[in-house]
Amino acid sequence: CKAMHVAQPAVVLASSRGIASFVCEYASPGKATEVRVTVLRQADSQVTEVCAATYMMGNELTFLDDSICTGTSSGNQVNLTIQGLRAMDTGLYICKVELMYPPPYYLGIGNGTQIYVIDPEPCPDSDF
């Protein structure tokens, strides 16, 4: 297992609709054809997996159908979007990149993007 540098923004504020996007960029030492990207959330010392996708270079990222993540890739950059976020989802979102094929296997973990989420103000009741 060889180490690889992964860069991501330090802080991002999600939109009022609970959507946060950020770029995860990795310094690929070779010509990988198969890459796996995992988003981890660290909050209160606990780390949980948010979503993961494996893709072939040049192809779209494919997350599971029920995933809250979507993404696109371009060269050594992955543009990740996390949807359906609420204030309670505020936390550090860490990008983990694995170059699966061809060997050697490389692993890189970013410092994390602190995502802040604000719940939208409830709409006042309307009489129709």
């Epitope: 923004p9 330090a10 802080v11 505020t90």
Partner: antibody, heavy 116, light 108 residues
Framework: QVQLVQSGAEVKKPGASVKVSCKAS????????ISWVRQAPGQGLEWMGW????????NYAQKLQGRVTMTTDTSTSTAYMELRSLRSDDTAVYYC?????????WGQGTLVTVSS | EIVMTQSPATLSLSPGKRATLSCRAS???????LSWYQQKPGQAPRLLIY???TRATGIPARFSGSGSGTNFTLTISSLQPEDFAVYYC?????????FGQGTKVEFK
């Protein structure tokens, strides 16, 4: 090295607006946020809100909602804070700070005096 | 909104003495998001401690932070003349972020 340089002191009349700038250097501007904090004479620090330089999204303190607007110009790595309908109790030193998420670097402060 | 309450408001001590400053949050705050700042007259605040206990770059070892949940402490082990200032705690946990009202450390 990281630096935040703010615009100079302003004197404004009640009801007017003020726009303070904060020019960042020494780091990747869009990777961090910029927060604004003010301090009235002899008082403590009051958080005003912040802007995510990565996407331009903003969040303001409840008491300033509707009167404050924070923006960034990523081409010049500059953040702006505009405060409208100024009142005498808006007289304060206004600071910008880099959000990472802790406020690890601060501008030198801009004194805004509101007086008729 | 999480309210941060600092005590005491003023601490009168002599150089060389140990200073213990308290910060209490109205709701539990993850220690990763608690910071302390020092401010001297006419100057901008300076980050001292983040993550409740990690010293910022260039901060002397006499400054230490501790605590978790709702109770946090800043300790200055042996006050130096340049340490007489106002100290603020702050959380950047959930929005909105808030500061404590400050503790002034003055010469006795």
């Amino acid at each position: 090295q990281v630096q935040l340089v703010q615009s100079g002191a302003e004197v404004k009349k009640p009801g007017a607006s003020v726009k303070v700038s904060c020019k960042a250097s020494g780091y990747t501007f869009t990777s961090y946020g910029i927060s604004w904090v003010r301090q009235a004479p002899g008082q403590g620090l009051e958080w005003m809100g912040w802007i995510s330089a990565y996407n331009g999204n903003t969040n303001y303190a409840q008491k300033l909602q509707g009167r404050v607007t924070m923006t960034t110009d990523t081409s010049t790595s500059t953040a702006y804070m505009e405060l409208r309908s100024l009142r005498s109790d808006d007289t304060a030193v206004y600071y910008c700070a880099r959000v990472g998420p802790h406020f690890d670097y601060w501008g030198q402060g801009t004194l805004v005096t509101v007086s008729s | 909104e999480i309210v941060m309450t600092q005590s005491p408001a003023t601490l009168s001590l002599s150089p060389g003495k140990r200073a213990t400053l308290s910060c209490r949050a109205s709701q539990s705050v993850s220690s990763s998001y608690l910071s302390w700042y020092q401010q001297k007259p006419g100057q901008a605040p300076r980050l001292l401690i983040y993550g409740a206990s990690t010293r910022a770059t260039g901060i002397p070892a006499r400054f230490s932070g501790s605590g978790s949940g709702t109770n946090f402490t800043l300790t200055i082990s042996s006050l130096q003349p340049e340490d007489f200032a106002v100290y603020y705690c702050q959380h950047v946990y959930h929005l909105p972020w808030t500061f404590g009202q400050g503790t002034k450390v003055e010469f006795k």
